[in-house]
């Protein structure tokens, strides 16, 4: 998160890290005891999910292996279009005040509304600064219309675009699969933006989740 | 000024593998895509295969899938390519190339111009 | 995986001429092409970048067009620097493909 904070300590307890190995590959959701919501870019063999803590690498989180990922059928490495993807974790989470599974919307926020996206990715452009703390950034929903303004065609009709006209605050590598959150409900997942990160009138491109709700749900029971 | 150095040319026997390196002096590539591109005598260039090393992100064409092997040690700014089970056919001048990401995420492999090119590294595959 | 074709493989012109290279992408890129010149035992040089955009050093005789799956590469006023050989690269996504390379040669 470029030009962001340090998040209130245990505001996000649906927030986790999908860790190859040791280190940070991208961010995730959890949206059921079983399951985590991530971008399909994120696809790996199998994740190290941490979950239950605001500090990446911390001891007393809980740790869970994943070894099974579904992308949604409609996702394209050309386009990058239906960035979506559902790990299942080999083991449930045990749930507590510190993990919590988020809220699928039941609608799409209008452009305007305030939300904060979070993730433990880098926190300067582009040189790297990986933080060890969750960081956080407010950013408000974008029209498509104003957002085909700056990526024309790469703009596809589920992404979804957020931040603060001439402000640097923004996502960036590392932070891929994180959560937007708007009134309390999951409106999207970190996808993509222009590089080097925090360019100002550049907004955040996500995967706008309230278009993938009957896609999540359909999954998650098939793959019980 | 930034400039890529391979080392030297290679002769190799078919079956084995060869390990191509690319170091960055004057200046740093983790920012930076780094491509391999491949020319056999008398021919036209061919992309075998690319990584950025902060998004850690791989790529190769699917002609080499299985067969390279594209790392990069952040640490001595150096990229390297491994070609294994090597044929007579992977005679060739090997480059590496720099270019910078336009995005990050899922669109980071979008538009990358490589702008700085290593001098490259013949590699004779013969019995 | 994109396939490039460009045309013409060879052309023979003279110094002064102007010269057209044309590049064709089997789908679709946007504005994401390259081109770049290659002399004989030298390392491939950048000269346009999306499609139109000129490389930083590169003579302004060199120009670019083209978006979608239609590409062109003009030199205005051959120079004697300029023969060369000349290839495209779809630069849309991974995996990059470069067209089969346009030698140009003095006639």
């Known amino acids: 998160i470029i030009d962001g904070y340090k998040c209130k300590e245990g505001s996000h307890p649906w927030q986790v890290a999908l860790l190859k190995g040791n280190q940070l590959h991208c961010g995730g959701v959890l949206v059921d005891k079983y399951w985590v919501l991530t971008a399909a870019h994120c696809k790996m063999g199998q994740y190290q999910v941490q979950l239950g803590s605001d500090k990446i690498g911390d001891q007393s989180a809980q740790k869970i292996k994943a070894t099974k990922s579904f992308r949604h059928p409609g996702y394209s490495t050309k386009t990058h279009v239906n960035d979506i993807m559902l790990v299942r974790l080999d083991e449930p989470v045990k749930m507590s005040s510190k993990v919590e599974a988020v809220q699928l919307p039941e609608h799409c926020e209008p452009p305007g509304t305030s939300c904060t996206v979070s993730g433990w990715g880098t926190t300067t452009s582009p040189d790297v600064t990986f933080p060890s703390d969750l960081m956080c950034s407010d950013v408000k929903l974008i029209s498509s219309r104003e957002c085909k303004k700056v990526y024309k065609d790469l703009l596809g009709k589920t992404m979804l675009c957020a931040g603060i006209p001439d402000s640097k605050t923004n996502t960036c590598n590392g932070d891929s699969g994180g959560p937007l959150v708007c009134n309390d409900t999951l409106q999207g997942l970190v996808s993509w933006g222009t590089y080097p990160c925090g360019q100002p009138n550049d907004p955040g491109v996500y995967t706008q989740v309230c278009k993938y709700k009957r896609w999540v749900m359909e999954t998650m029971k098939t793959h019980r | 000024q930034v400039q890529l150095v391979q080392s030297g040319a290679e002769v190799k026997k078919p079956g084995s593998s060869v390990k191509v390196s690319c170091k960055a002096s004057?200046?740093?590539?983790?920012?930076?895509?780094i491509s391999w591109v491949r020319q056999a005598p008398g021919q036209g260039l061919e992309w075998m295969g690319a990584?950025?090393?902060?998004?850690?992100?791989?790529n190769y064409a699917q002609k080499f899938q299985g067969r390279v092997t594209i790392t990069a040690d952040e640490s001595t700014s150096t990229a390297y390519m491994e070609l294994s089970s090597l044929r007579s056919e992977d005679t060739a001048v090997y480059y590496c190339a720099r270019g910078a990401p336009n995005y990050y995420g899922a669109q980071s492999s979008r538009g990358i111009a490589f702008d700085i090119w290593g001098q490259g590294t013949m590699v004779t595959v013969s019995s | 995986d994109i396939q490039m074709t460009q045309s013409p493989s060879s052309v023979s012109a003279s110094v002064g001429d102007r010269v057209t290279i044309t590049c064709r992408a089997s789908?679709?890129?946007?504005?994401?092409l390259a081109w770049y010149q290659q002399k004989p035992g030298k390392a491939p040089k950048l000269l346009i970048y999306a499609a139109s955009s000129l490389q930083s050093g590169v003579p302004s005789r060199f120009s670019g067009s083209g978006s979608g799956t239609d590409f062109t590469l003009t030199i205005s006023s051959l120079q004697p620097e300029d023969f060369a050989t000349y290839y495209c690269?779809?630069?849309?996504?991974?995996?990059?493909?470069f067209g089969g390379g346009t030698k140009v040669e003095i006639k």
């Open positions: 990584i950025i090393p902060i998004f850690g992100v791989a």
């Open positions: 004057g200046g740093t590539f983790n920012n930076y895509a």
């Open positions: 789908q679709g890129i946007s504005s994401w």
């Open positions: 690269v779809q630069a849309n996504a991974f995996p990059y493909k």
